[in-house]
């Protein structure tokens, strides 16, 4: 007998999602228009390519990276796409309302789509901690709250701390990680007897997760350089990110082997550790003056990632109910913090090098920014978790966690598909 979507969700989801989509269309109709200025077409194409890289990262990279569960791979990929599509629409409007609205209309440019895709990426990072335990109706709520929280965080940081697009978007790693972990903490944790096999990884889904990791690995330099305002800063960011992720791959594979008693390589470690360098270098990728520093960062990040993957899952599974293979949350939280610390160190070196007496104040500002990002992530994450626990969403029963058949129509109804 095939498992069906609960009746109430079948009524609730289409109504909720389509009403929301209709509302978004109306908001776009009344409040937005395209940038009408004529521009050099070559520049337009180049600008679009950066946005395309970000979309590939989000849809294919993060979509497949989270698809390693034996019985939840379809849902991981498709739900990611659903959240990305919804998140980008809401993020474009929100960013426009927060930054442009005094002029009466939100002007949509390729840059605003780029920003929106990066905001939506935040949700895709966070959701790794809860995928398999929530339905689409709940994910819609999560998208709306997280994109709103991140948009407001960026606006506050921009206004209070005077930071640019790149700097306030690079808090995304820490923000997304802590948001996801705090939502996971609120959701029902125990996996009932008989469902343990569902949160295990299988060979084919693990291969698709590796494919996701490869796409992220290839396009991470685009992500870290997308919001920088000059060619020289972008060039630096691309080079440094590339060196960092290259070293973190070598470190991840060799470190994973080192961490295993028989010297075997863990798929789960490798999936996430290959990206470690890109996350750690993100905040300061345009500032790092030479390749060796980016490479050292990639090495340290890879080791932290493998170490975290070895020792943290037990704790996360007990406390937060996060399965062993969903290690993006705590991985990004550690590596995001490392990246922020590196930025603060570089800031201090710059201040010392300039003979500037403002070191303490500059460090305090940076710590203030980071603390604000973590606090808003935790608070909005807890709020989202509480909202997701409301009965109206008809959350999947714990026995139906990590099960594609709850959500998808499979003609052959095979359990192992």
């Amino acid at each position: 007998m095939s498992s069906k979507y609960p009746r109430s969700v079948r009524r609730c989801l289409p109504l909720w999602a389509l009403t929301l989509e209709a509302a978004l269309i109306l908001l776009f109709y009344f409040f937005t228009h395209y940038d009408a200025s004529l521009e050099d077409q070559k520049g337009l194409v180049a600008s679009y390519q950066v946005g395309q890289d970000l979309t590939v990262m989000a849809a294919i990279g993060l979509g497949f990276l989270t698809s390693s569960f034996r019985r939840h791979s379809w849902s991981s990929v498709a739900f990611n796409l659903f959240m990305l599509a919804l998140g980008v629409q809401w993020a474009i409007l929100l960013d426009g309302f927060l930054s442009q609205f005094p002029s009466g209309k939100v002007v949509i440019t390729l840059f605003s789509i780029r920003l929106a895709t990066m905001s939506a990426l935040s949700v895709l990072i966070s959701v790794d901690a809860v995928l398999g335990k929530v339905n689409l109706a709940q994910l819609v709520v999560m998208v709306l709250v997280e994109v709103t929280a991140l948009g407001n965080l960026r606006m506050v940081i921009s206004n209070i701390f005077n930071t640019d697009y790149h700097m306030n978007m690079m808090h995304i790693y820490v923000f997304a990680a802590y948001f996801g972990l705090s939502v996971a903490w609120c959701l029902p944790k125990p996996l009932p007897e008989g469902t343990e096999d569902k949160d295990q990884t299988a060979t084919i889904p693990s291969l698709s997760a590796m494919l996701g990791a490869l796409f992220l690995w290839m396009f991470w330099p685009s992500f870290n350089s997308a919001l920088l305002r000059s060619p020289i800063e972008r060039k630096n960011a691309v080079f440094n990110t590339y060196y960092a992720v290259a070293v973190s791959v070598v470190t991840a594979i060799s470190g994973s082997s080192l961490a295993h008693p028989q010297g075997k390589i863990s798929k789960t470690y490798v999936h996430s550790a290959v990206l470690a360098g890109g996350v750690a270098v993100g905040t300061s990728c345009h500032l790092i003056p030479s390749p060796w520093l980016a490479m050292v960062l990639g090495l340290v990040a890879g080791l932290i990632s493998v170490g975290g993957a070895k020792y943290l899952p037990g704790c996360c599974n007990r406390v937060l109910g996060i399965p062993h293979s969903s290690i993006m949350g705590y991985n990004f939280s550690l590596l995001g913090l490392l990246g922020e610390i590196i930025y603060i160190v570089l800031l201090v070196l710059d201040t010392v090098g300039a003979g500037n007496g403002m070191i303490g104040f500059q460090v305090l500002l940076s710590i203030g920014e980071l603390s604000l990002a973590i606090v808003i992530a935790l608070m909005s994450g807890l709020l989202t978790g509480l909202l997701l626990n409301l009965k109206i969403w008809k959350a999947p029963h714990e026995a139906k966690y990590f099960d594609d058949q709850v959500f998808w129509k499979f003609p052959h109804l095979a359990v192992g598909f």
């Epitope: 050099d40 005077n162 710059d350 300039a354």
Partner: antibody, heavy 126, light 106 residues
Amino acid sequence: EVQLLEQSGGGVVQPGRSLRLSCAASGFTFSSYGMHWVRQAPGKGLEWVAVIWFDGSNKEYADSVKGRFTISRDNSKNTLYLQMNSLRAEDTAVYYCAREEVVRGVILWSRKFDYWGQGTLVTVSS
Amino acid sequence: AELTQSPSSLSASVGDRVTITCRASQTIGRYLNWYQQRPGKAPKLLVYAVSSLQSGAPSRFSGSGSGTHFTLTITSLQPEDFATYFCQQSYSSPFTFGQGTKVEIK
């Protein structure tokens, strides 16, 4: 090679009407630099108006001109534009285009407006 | 960040040492530039990143400061230095300018 920013398009215009300023660049790789418009009302200080990134991907405006002015560039023609709509008396000023250069400090990047156009006067009057 | 220059004008003689101050409403790190504008001309960059002298600018101009408090010093005023001086922050958009300091002949 001498870096030049040659401005044109200023003049007298009635309130509510439109005007388009141009700034033709030569002597440097135009597509590698962010470009700005800065204005100066008669007898007053300098006021930043707008910026466009090197690849045209992003534009930012001063609150006083948001929704009325549009900055754009054509990298194939080495030209920067400022389309000014719904002009008001308070928009009367000399408008300058300026090149933004990014230079590395000890570690952080620093920005400077190292080359300026000669300026073009826009008078909004009925 | 808003910038406030002082004094708004000053009178000095050739050979004098002149100091102009610029205060920011919030920390702008080292993102501060100084420009000189002669009557009827476009502004010209003198000093960038607080203390770096722009190529072609005379060495009698120097900048200093940190965080929120900055100064431009002209060690020995020359006849061609009688002009208006503006500070500008390039820390974040909008890239605001100070209101200007006019240096006049005594």
